[in-house]
Interface confidence: low
Amino acid sequence: MGPNSEDKNFPRTVMVNLNIHNRNTNTNPKRSSDYYDRSTSPWNLHRNEDPERYPSVIWEAKCRHLGCINADGNVDYHMNSVPIQQEILVLRREPPHSPNSFRLEKILVSVGCTCVTPIVHHVA
Amino acid sequence: MGPNSEDKNFPRTVMVNLNIHNRNTNTNPKRSSDYYDRSTSPWNLHRNEDPERYPSVIWEAKCRHLGCINADGNVDYHMNSVPIQQEILVLRREPPHSPNSFRLEKILVSVGCTCVTPIVHHVA
């Protein structure tokens, strides 16, 4: 998921214009803002800041419970809240503190949580 | 979530080394491979390919159901499966087909799905 293929035809060093083009013109940034709270596998968002990275701020999801919220609003431990993870690309200053030289870096972030049936091991 | 802050202290054009450094050394890429099927809000993954973009292949999640899977294995339409979305950074060839000149682009991708309580509108 996410950038999980290494493109072999790309050159090693390239020029990149950091003036971001945002393709998300039709999206309402608040439309999923409360999923973290309404989910049966709710999560909290934690700020991860690193001035040597672009973007410098990334939000990490941490599931609130081991189990999932049932219809009564209680935690059901027969189900599991698990993080949905995605590899994303970021730019890392290289060498450190460099103003205009970066290296592409792949990092794994937790985007949110989902409720799954646990893997049951049957004993003979 | 994801790269959602614009860093004002960055220069406009930079050099980027595309030899990716992967920080996910301790992660098993398949460890969450079956969440899409075990989730109460299961999803399918769809390939989005664009040779003008780096990475050229991105995976998009599409929730299988409007509702969520209940304990009986049936779809419960009193709950909603919704996509968890994240903004990610990609490189877009600029001008088109350029071999070594890119522009940073922000796109919204659906990473997976979560089950949420629907918004209920109460009629007076």
């Epitope: 293929s5 | 398949k30 079956d34 099927d37 993954l45 390939r47 390919e49």
Partner: antibody, heavy 124, light 107 residues
């Protein structure tokens, strides 16, 4: 041009295990859904199951207790195992590539490349 | 499971005829339907996805329509190579399910 080549035992006795392998030539293994379908003599097509690009499997519930689909990405191959076969499992078995295609903001699915088919007879 | 019912199960036609095959789903599948052609002893061939989009290389005499539960495959001006069995396949949900097939034979 992508081609699928399949092989495996064509004659089995009841209670034995059917084992078929499908190799992908001339195209990427990553990024598609790899399916098995069967067709009893003179009858229609029945979907058995699929394995996706991250190793997740989904099976037809009618066969789920007996079927296993696995992959060997290093060889660009995927396999089908069907346990405890009976005469009702006599059929031509096909492997096929599942692909998702976008139209607007929606995705559609199709089995665009098929193996040559392997006739399997179960007889005592 | 979503049951896909095709009709007719067989039909006889002549070269140049306009042929219509229908496929009915047991529940709403939006436009998540494809069509496949299979000739005797041959592998199925992918014709149409998403109800009406032709797969690359498929002649324009083939067309699809419908939405929800009722779908149609139409062959305008039937050609000799079109005599075959046609199957619909729903991809709205798992398990994927095929219609039982419609055999188009010579009149």
């Amino acid at each position: 041009q992508v081609q699928l080549q399949q092989w495996g035992a064509g004659l089995l006795k009841p209670s034995e295990t059917l084992s078929l392998t499908c190799a992908v030539f001339g195209g990427s293994f990553d990024g598609y859904y790899w399916n098995w379908i069967r067709q009893p003599p003179g009858k229609g097509l029945e979907w058995i199951g699929e394995i996706n690009h991250i190793g997740g499997t989904i099976y037809n519930p009618s066969l789920k207790s007996r079927v296993t689909i696995s992959e060997d990405t290093s060889k660009n191959q995927f396999s089908l195992r069907l346990n405890s076969v009976t005469a009702a499992d006599t059929a031509t078995y096909y492997c096929a590539r599942g692909i998702t295609m976008g139209r607007g903001n929606y995705y559609y699915y199709g089995l665009d490349v098929w193996g040559q088919g392997t006739p399997v007879t179960v007889s005592s | 499971d979503i049951l896909m019912t095709q009709s007719p199960s067989s039909l006889s036609a002549s070269v140049g005829d306009r042929v219509t095959i229908t496929c009915r789903a047991s529940q709403d599948i939006k436009n998540d339907l494809g069509w496949y052609q299979q000739k005797p002893g041959k592998v199925p061939k992918f014709l149409i996805f998403g109800t009406y989009s032709l797969q690359s290389g498929v002649p324009s005499r083939f067309s699809g329509s419908g939405s929800g539960t009722d779908f149609t495959l139409t062959i305008n001006s039937l050609q000799p190579e079109d005599f075959a069995t046609y199957y619909c396949l729903q991809d709205n949900n798992y398990p994927r399910t095929f219609g039982q097939g419609t055999k188009v034979g010579f009149k």
